[in-house]
């Protein structure tokens, strides 16, 4: 299927001009390659009429141009002084030959309709109303006024001043006069349909002295607006129907042969195919509303219509707006998993794509809610604090410049299952939908923190350990302190070279975090997680409460009250064949003030975990295992 898109049918009248826009995929090659407009002959040959290389055929000389708009990925063909000879089949396309990528366009040029010389032409859109002005001479002021519609043989009454109304115009036609002006009457017809188009005659009086006026009413279907969108991207249908329908229910439907199937309306109807990826914005006082659809699929391509009616369904004679949506399969939006699976108590890390050209845009994550017109309240964002009910378990990690940001949600429950949107305040095409499925956990989590009920004592040393399985051995481990502005990764200090491990003991892989000395600001949520480069993996969370020292408890008395242990990542995996008696010592980390310590230790973790890490008088914290960690202040 060609990725070039344009209007399928273009119609005009002799002497007028047309402007034809063709869309092409957003690539550097496409922006610079030759654009052409050619006419298809009976033999299947397509004869170039105009191209972006400067070629202009004789028959287009002085009346056509082709303009490329690389910033929009479109080119436009303008043709003036149309004649009926211009009716035919054309192609707009890209490439060095006319056999390149193209789109078929049918152009129809009609004759100017012949109308009586004094005819007044009114051109209105379907669903709108028209007010026809009917002048008359003063002597006909007392006479009957009427409007009739010409049929083949006669003129069928629409309405007259004796309050006679044609049944098909009841409730739609009104005859009236304004103020004291006795030389003109008006007929207003509302909710116009195609059937209302035609020739009308206004009349005041009877016989030869009657005043008559010819009126031509043209009722037009709105020209569909072309929308060219990438697969997996997002589209917004901006619908502006006018104040007169501001209080009516609104809908968006998709044409299906003769009918238009409602996709969504403001009365709560929604097509299941669009579950989790559609929203209708609140209506405003001017009758404007918009429908947002994310995660575009091939099958979403088609002809869409928005409208307003109390039923929330398409109704003849009500205003509409139309679009032709093309879904380009050569998408710039990366193909990511649209379903992410998690388990209760576990976590998910969701990679959200954004337009790499907009790395400074603000990133957001919202949860789609289908009730009413649908909502997507933002749960977290670059500058948007985490919503209160997600405290301690949700964070957004922006990785500037690489076209991806990550949202991590942990402590999952089945309530978290649903649809979520990734979006920015920039290019709205890059909105994507993720479905989160949460199953009941059937085994222990991969990451486990001990102690689980964490209460640290002010001024003392406190260590928490995060146990991870061997499969995470090669991944980077981290601790971060959560706040409603994000999860700040605690700096780690790699202690010495890693040793190769003969085997990996499932029970002994851990990364520890030590708070030394504990302060009131240390209270809060901490996450232990794994990542590989910029790709985040699993996390687990723990809340550390800080309480005052109770009388009689031991305490650390550092020489410098402000001194705090640095986060040190001591990664030592011990060969399981080495006996505990060998006491492999970890190098002294040295004095680091006001910081945190992370330790990542090997197979004597059990003993480290069991130890109380009581502080000695000089402020050193020691583990009671055969490994000694000296933290000098």
């Amino acid at each position: 299927k060609s990725p070039i898109f344009g209007p399928q049918e273009v119609s005009s009248i002799e002497g007028d001009s047309v402007s034809i826009t063709c869309y092409y995929p957003d690539t550097s090659v496409n922006r610079h390659t030759r654009k052409y407009w050619c006419r298809q002959g009976a033999s299947g040959m397509c004869t170039t009429l105009i191209s972006s290389n400067g070629y202009l055929s004789k028959e287009y000389s002085g009346r056509a141009n082709l303009i490329n708009f690389p910033e929009n990925n479109t080119f436009v063909i303008n043709i003036e002084q149309l004649t009926q000879d211009d009716t035919g089949s054309y192609k707009c396309g890209l490439g060095t030959s006319n056999r390149g990528l193209s789109f078929d366009v049918s152009l129809e040029v009609s004759q100017v309709p012949e109308l009586p010389s004094d005819t007044h032409v009114y051109t209105k859109d379907i669903g709108r109303n028209v007010t026809i002005e009917c002048p008359f001479k003063r002597e006909n002021a007392p006479s009957k006024k009427s409007l009739c519609k010409k049929t083949n043989q006669s003129c069928e009454l629409v309405i007259d001043s004796t309050e006679k109304v044609n049944p098909s115009y009841i409730g739609r036609a009104k005859l009236f006069m304004k103020g004291t002006d006795l030389t003109v009457f008006y007929v207003n017809i509302s909710h116009l349909t195609h059937n209302d188009a035609g020739l009308y005659i206004c009349q005041a009086g009877e016989g030869p002295s009657a005043d008559k006026k010819n009126v031509d009413l043209q009722v037009l279907a709105p020209e569909p607006e072309l929308l060219y969108k990438d697969l997996r991207s997002s589209v917004t249908f901006e619908c502006d129907l006018g104040r007169e329908v501001a209080n009516e229910a609104k809908y968006l439907c998709r044409m299906n042969k003769e009918t238009c199937d409602v996709i969504i309306n403001t009365l709560g109807k929604r097509d299941p195919d669009f579950e989790g990826r559609i929203l209708i914005t609140p209506k405003d006082d001017n009758g404007r509303f918009s429908v947002l659809i994310t995660g575009l699929r091939k099958e979403d391509a088609g002809h869409y219509q928005c409208g307003a009616h109390s039923s929330g369904l398409p109704q003849e004679g009500w205003p509409i707006q139309t679009w032709q949506l093309f879904v380009n399969e050569e998408s710039t939006i990366p193909n990511r998993r649209s379903v992410v699976k998690g388990v209760t108590g576990g976590s998910v890390a969701i990679a959200c794509p954004y337009n790499p050209k907009e790395s400074s845009s603000l990133k957001y994550w919202c949860r789609w809610e289908g009730d009413g017109n649908g909502h997507c309240p933002v749960l977290v964002g670059t500058q948007a604090q985490v919503q209160e009910e997600y405290e301690g378990r949700l964070a957004l990690f922006d990785q500037p410049g690489n076209g991806t940001y990550t949202v991590i949600l942990n402590q999952l429950t089945t309530e978290d299952a649903g649809f979520y949107w990734c979006l920015t305040n920039g290019d709205s095409r890059w909105r994507t939908t993720i479905e989160l499925q949460v199953a009941e956990a059937t085994r222990e989590p991969n990451l486990e923190v001990t102690p689980q009920n964490a209460t640290a004592v002010l001024g003392e040393t406190f260590t928490v350990s995060c146990h991870y399985p061997c499969k995470f051995y090669s991944q980077e481990k981290y601790w971060c302190k959560w706040s409603n502005k994000g999860c700040h990764i605690l700096p780690s200090h790699d202690e010495g070279a890693r040793q190769s491990s003969v085997s990996c003991d499932q029970s002994s892989q851990l990364v520890s975090m030590t708070l030394n000395p504990v302060s009131k600001e240390d209270e809060g949520w901490y996450w232990c997680g794994v990542k590989q480069g910029q790709t985040y993996g699993e996390t687990t969370a723990i809340y550390i409460a800080v309480e005052e020292r109770t009388r009689g408890s031991s305490h650390v008395n550092p020489t410098d009250a402000n001194a705090r242990a640095k986060v040190a990542l001591e990664e030592e995996v011990v060969d399981s064949s080495i006996s505990e008696k060998e006491n492999k010592a970890i190098p002294n980390p040295g004095p680091f003030a006001n910081e945190r310590e992370i330790q990542n230790v090997g197979d004597q973790a059990q003993e480290n975990r069991a130890s109380g890490d009581a502080g000695s008088a000089d402020g050193q914290s020691r583990s009671s295992s055969s490994k000694h960690h000296h933290h000098h202040h």
């Epitope: 997507c376 964002g381 500058q383 604090q385």
Partner: nanobody, 131 residues
Amino acid sequence: EVQLVESGGGLVQAGGSLRLSCAASGRTFDSYAMGWFRQAPGKEREFVAAISWTGGSTDYADSVKGRFTISRDNAKNTVYLQMDSLKPEDTAVYYCAAEVVGRDVTTMYRVSGLEYEYDYWGQGTQVTVSS
């Protein structure tokens, strides 16, 4: 409830520039669409500029288009109005206003130039442009 405090007003010569700031109190600044209005002596209060809660959408009165720029910093709970090429007719008290829209995708681009749609107002800051 949000409190709005404008600052940055003052006396400036025609052709000069000023930058107004509006600091908002409260945790939920990013659930408000913000606007600037002004009132010249003896005249009605009129719309100047508005910005959506994300900052992704802005709107301006015709009289200031191309000269004034509205922006916001949600991390600092502040909205700004950069006023360049000032004219004597820009002299007025400038008010900052907040409309509760909620942090929702459906309101991401919502901006309003209608006074009655705003829920909170600042006290105003005087801007005087001399010729």
